[in-house]
């Protein structure tokens, strides 16, 4: 999906209002310096591409993020503020349902969510205003 035509300010507002708090809850008890951030993004569409990938694509050692509250709210925000996003996610949703039934917080998941926090921070405040 090409995130170029999303309403970035509305997504930012959704993040600051709710998603950020859910990420903090997920990370509670984890030190901010515990993980090295290896994923970065260069502009807002790229940030959303990386956020979507880390949030919804199962990875080795962390298959369960898509069922977390922050993930569901992220999905809702993208569906509302990115034209045509919902349609592209139908197949992905089917696969996600098959992928995992239970929620397990592993160290790998905590590391992934730490990466997500950095990506969201970057998305919210790109130094050069990308439209």
């Amino acid at each position: 999906y090409d995130f170029t035509n999303c309403d970035f300010e509305k997504i930012k507002a959704a993040y600051l209002s709710t998603i950020s708090k859910d990420l903090i809850t997920y990370m509670s008890g984890t030190k901010s310096t515990e993980f090295n951030n290896t994923v970065s993004c260069s502009n807002r569409p790229h940030c959303l591409t990386e956020i979507q990938s880390l949030t919804f694509n199962p990875t080795a050692g962390c298959a369960s993020l898509a069922k977390e509250m922050f993930a569901m709210k992220t999905k809702a925000a993208l569906a509302i503020w990115c034209p045509g996003y919902s349609e592209t996610q139908i197949n992905a949703t089917q696969a996600m349902k098959k992928a995992r039934k239970s929620k397990v917080t592993t160290n790998k998941c905590l590391e992934q969510v730490s990466q997500l926090q950095g990506l969201w921070r970057r998305f919210n405040r790109p130094l050069l205003k990308q439209q």
Partner: antibody, heavy 120, light 111 residues
Framework: EAQLVQSGAEVKKPGSSVKVSCKAS????????MHWVRQAPGQGLEWIGA????????SYNQKFKDRATLTVDKSTRTAYMELSSLRSEDTAVYYC?????????????WGQGTTVTVSS | DIVLTQSPATLSLSPGERATLSCRAS??????????MHWYQQKPGQPPRLLLY???NLGSGIPARFSGSGSGTDFTLTISSLEPEDFAVYYC?????????FGQGTKLEIK
């Protein structure tokens, strides 16, 4: 605990340059915008610019665009601000500051400040 | 650039009194229903300290006697009952539009 420690006071001649350092600890340096703000004696706060350590991208106040250079060394978790062609009006306390956790655009961690005096 | 005008320049009050500081922006600092205006306190020889973010949210460790309100172009910082340690200079700052700008400051002094 997130902390920023700046280099010591500097006395410079007009026309010369100064490079102030800001060493970060207690947070993932590469993912936070780092800003520089100055304050002339008895005056208010003036934004110089910012840098994103992740890729070195910068944003400057137009007033300083030609004279200020912001850089980072990720290996030592240090941000630098170099100001060239110094004049007496550049006499000020220079602060580095970290932008907040969420990208709201406020500064939640500040360095202690570096006094730069420009005098002939 | 967005110009932030703070008033009054100096406010003389006594401990226990209520302080009301104003910050007016030359254009709106709102975006998608959020107001990107922040407030700082600065004491002599110290860096500024965050008081309030996004107009009305208390910074970490800030006492509840501090509160903020406003949206668009008009914002207010209120200190309900002044403590001796509250006498300082207060700055507003906007981030909605580059470049980031600060107000010129309001000095709160003991009467």
């Amino acid at each position: 605990e997130a902390q920023l420690v700046q280099s010591g006071a500097e006395v410079k001649k007009p026309g010369s340059s100064v490079k102030v350092s800001c060493k970060a600890s207690g947070f993932t340096f590469s993912t936070y915008n780092m800003h520089w703000v100055r304050q002339a004696p008895g005056q208010g706060l003036e934004w110089i610019g910012a840098i994103y350590p992740g890729n070195g991208e910068t944003s400057y106040n137009q007033k300083f665009k030609d004279r200020a250079t912001l850089t980072v060394d990720k290996s030592t978790r240090t941000a630098y601000m170099e100001l060239s062609s110094l004049r007496s009006e550049d006499t000020a306390v220079y602060y580095c500051a970290r932008e907040d956790d969420y990208g709201e655009g406020y500064f939640d961690v500040w360095g202690q400040g570096t006094t730069v005096t420009v005098s002939s | 650039d967005i110009v932030l005008t703070q008033s009054p320049a100096t406010l003389s009050l006594s401990p226990g009194e209520r302080a009301t500081l104003s910050c007016r922006a030359s254009e709106s600092v709102d975006s998608s229903g959020l107001s990107f205006m922040h407030w700082y306190q600065q004491k002599p020889g110290q860096p500024p300290r965050l008081l309030l973010y996004r107009a009305s949210n208390l910074g970490s460790g800030i006492p509840a006697r501090f509160s903020g309100s406003g949206s668009g172009t008009d914002f207010t910082l209120t200190i309900s009952s002044l403590e001796p340690e509250d006498f300082a200079v207060y700055y507003c700052q906007q981030i909605n539009t580059d470049p980031l700008t600060f107000g010129q400051g309001t000095k709160l002094e003991i009467k």
